[in-house]
């Protein structure tokens, strides 16, 4: 005897108080697949968690995190906080720029200083955890009488502050 | 910084109710959720329920569903966890804990024994 | 439920020593898995959370690790200020269960 249910699409379930039909999926459920016995109960976006998506009769909530706060896992199943400017998010959570890096925002990676130098400029401002290094006019440029036919004197190391 | 301040201990005689506050500061208290969590002398820790502050709405361990009620008055940021008809078995540490996911702040505690 | 097996349910260690808790839960909780210290005082205190992440403040020393059903706390070099107990639990499903805690005490 052919199994009635797999004949149940998404957004149903097979009914078997009901001679197997084919009953919609009650409020606040769904079922992402056809053939199943039971629809699940939709997430709740609540607290720490807003709603992304609402659910439908064939797809469940997705959920995101309040402001100030981003997902972790697939499924936003916890919420972590945005790391300060001057961290980078690692798999153990926030931590400090290393020295020679930086990050301006609440979110993304460590990013290397400029390389003054490489454009024939020296370092006007130092960097810091959170600031890039500020790029002046070249060495040369600086000079009193200099001509431009003065090759560039190397720029010191960028962001290096004297200790 | 962020803190749960709890009510104090309280000695309860069988069949009585117990109500334990959890006054949160240094956050937006109706931002995040409000868990209950006990801890019988001598046992592991024992998930009872939670409240959504913005909406009032619960979710309770079956365990406790008839026994327990949790509420809360934005206007103070305080959550209540209600629990009735006590038994000898319901003296435990109880705590309010914060949610991310994870409990990232805990209250200190609030020990209810029930004793005739 | 969701069932969190905690082993061994109490250790003997001294300064120093590598500390492994261990933590199996009955179905997979897809890295939805939190450690807690508890000192005698009662006070509970959040160490790692999604399996790996340290909580802030948290020393460096601890560590967490696993995936699917089981999951692992590790103490690199145990301080006098470890002795406590410690407790896993799941965030996958509700109702929110605890393992039974593993009592750390001082050889």
């Known amino acids: 005897l052919q199994d009635l249910c797999s004949n149940c699409p998404a957004g149903t379930f097979c009914d078997n108080n009901r001679s197997q039909i084919c009953s919609p999926c009650p409020p606040n459920s769904f079922s992402s697949a056809g053939g199943q016995r039971t629809c699940d109960i939709c997430r709740q976006c609540k607290g720490v968690f807003k709603t992304r998506k609402e659910c439908s009769s064939t797809s469940n909530a997705e959920c995101d995190c309040i402001s100030g706060y981003h997902c972790l896992g697939a499924e936003c199943s916890m919420c972590e906080q945005d790391c300060k400017q001057g961290q980078e998010l690692t798999k153990k959570g926030c931590k400090d720029c290393c020295f020679g890096t930086f990050n301006d925002q609440k979110r993304g990676i460590c990013r290397p200083w400029t390389n003054c130098s490489l454009d024939g400029k020296s370092v006007l401002v130092n960097g810091t955890k959170e600031r890039d290094v500020v790029c002046g006019p070249s060495p040369a440029d600086l000079s009193p009488g200099a001509s431009s036919a003065t090759p560039p004197a190397p720029a010191r190391e960028p962001g290096h502050s004297p200790q | 910084q962020v803190q749960l301040v709890q009510s104090g201990a309280e000695v309860k005689k069988p069949g009585a109710s117990v109500k334990v506050s959890c006054k949160a500061s240094g956050y937006t208290f109706a931002g995040f959720e409000m868990h209950w969590v006990r801890q019988a002398p001598g046992q592991g820790l024992e998930w009872m329920g939670a409240?959504?502050?913005?909406?009032?709405?619960?979710d309770y361990n079956q365990k406790f569903k008839d026994r327990v009620t949790m509420t809360r008055d934005t206007s103070i940021s305080t959550a209540y966890m209600e629990l009735s008809r006590l038994r000898s078995d319901d003296t435990a540490v109880y705590y309010c804990a914060r949610d991310l996911g994870y409990f990232d702040v805990w209250g200190q505690g609030t020990l209810v024994t029930v004793s005739s | 439920d969701i069932q969190m097996t905690q082993s061994p349910s109490s250790l003997s260690a001294s300064v120093g020593d590598r500390v492994t808790i261990t933590c199996r839960a009955s179905?997979?909780?897809?890295?939805?898995l939190n450690w807690y210290q508890q000192k005698p005082g009662g006070a509970v205190k959040l160490l790692i959370y999604?399996?790996?992440r340290l909580h802030s403040g948290v020393p460096s020393r601890f560590s967490g690790s696993g995936s699917g059903t089981d999951y692992t706390l590790t103490i690199s070099s145990l301080q006098p200020e470890d002795f406590a107990t410690y407790f896993c639990?799941?965030?996958?499903?509700?109702?929110?269960?605890f393992g039974g805690g593993t009592k750390v005490e001082i050889r």
């Open positions: 409240i959504d502050p913005k909406t009032g709405g619960t």
């Open positions: 999604y399996t790996s």
């Open positions: 639990q799941q965030s996958e499903k509700l109702p929110r269960t």
């Open positions: 179905q997979d909780i897809r890295s939805n």
